[in-house]
Amino acid sequence: VSPTFQVVNSIAPVQECSTQLDIVIVLDGSNSIYPWDSVTAFLNDLLERMDIGPKQTQVGIVQYGENVTHEFNLNKYSSTEEVLVAANKIVQRGGRQTMTALGIDTARKEAFTEARGARRGVKKVMVIVTDGESHDNHRLKKVIQDCEDENIQRFSIAILGSYNRGNLSTEKFVEEIKSIASEPTEKHFFNVSDELALVTIVKTLGERIFALEA
């Protein structure tokens, strides 16, 4: 604009970003996740960054351990506030087994269905949070390929807490959780030293999820 308020040059606006994502968070709820409120704090920080609604981002949560529970479906809540309240009420289901393949497969087959609120043509995102090698890792390769075939973008988070508490090697575990993440792995895989450190990755995780919207 010139000093006399005449248009001298115009720039086309940046293409408007779609704010539509269907996000399913797959939480390991086995006993070794401790303390559980570190998980709910992580959820709180992540979810409050989201513009949640039927025409915007939708969030569903699945918890797994020895078996799988749909905590809430993608279309259950229509605002960020409602989702935050629900996420804070999620209790740890417990169990000794970590059936990660089962958790991911259930999310793919059930949580991402239209019956549970998934929208046709909307990008699907799965966030997997776990702290141990899966007891069903023989199924993991196929389960991940099935997600890939359905264009589900996967972010995986490895919590090293139980390994560090027991002075155990994390190498095999980290490799497994990396294999869950979409390519490029360095943009889709996170690891944290313990449960308390989950909140430290929220900003970056949020940015990377919403980079998918562009």
């Epitope: 086995s30 006993n31 070794s32 401790y34 303390p35 559980w36 351990g65 020895e66 209790v91 740890q92 289901r93 417990g94 169990g95 000794r96 139980s162 508490r165 027991g166 155990l168 313990d194 308390l196």
Partner: antibody
Framework: EVQLVQSGAEVKKPGESLRISCKGS????????IGWVRQMPGKGLEWMGI????????RYSPSFQGQVTISADKSISTAYLQWSSLKASDTAMYYC??????????????????WGQGTLVTVS | EIVLTQSPGTLSLSPGERATLSCRAS???????LAWYQQKPAQAPRLLIY???RRATGIPDRFSGSGSGTDFTLTISRLEPEDFAVYYC?????????FGQGTTVEIK
Amino acid sequence: EVQLVQSGAEVKKPGESLRISCKGSGYSVTSYWIGWVRQMPGKGLEWMGIIYPGDSDTRYSPSFQGQVTISADKSISTAYLQWSSLKASDTAMYYCARLQGDCSGGTCYGHFDYWGQGTLVTVS
Amino acid sequence: EIVLTQSPGTLSLSPGERATLSCRASQSVSSSYLAWYQQKPAQAPRLLIYVASRRATGIPDRFSGSGSGTDFTLTISRLEPEDFAVYYCQQYGTSSWTFGQGTTVEIK
């Protein structure tokens, strides 16, 4: 609502056997460890041992190893503490408590978030 | 085995006053895995604080925990009549659980 309900008070003679119980409800009982804690008259709290009802994996405090037996019956969501031969020094209040945490891979950690009402055992 | 020593043994205070209870460990408590419990006469212990500073569900905010390593503190900012009880600290970072001997908070 999470609840741990313990069996009633017991009066026994030295040398007798005894089994007390702790029944869980309001949560997946087979998925959480249950601990036992002793409180002798006018004294503090002592951890005795812990069991995972799902598979009956059990750990004992060195002080109580061989003195008591901890068991569980997952079909009825119940954990047990038993003695084969009671002594007068076993007179105490015994509490069961749910562990929020884990005891796998040789490492135990966590706090006891729900407690039973206690079972008073008197041996005289 | 980590030994926990609580002080003072007895604290005599009036309602409305601030209570400061100490728990000292014989060696460092890993990851600040320390809890505080309240026990009233003829009742089971009740969880107040875990991981040194996190309040359990339903615990009023007048209760707060702090500390790390070997020194931990439970503070009750303003004593209510129902707060007069015995308080135990407990560590759980060593594959076993040990309790302190307790601090009695009594009405002055």
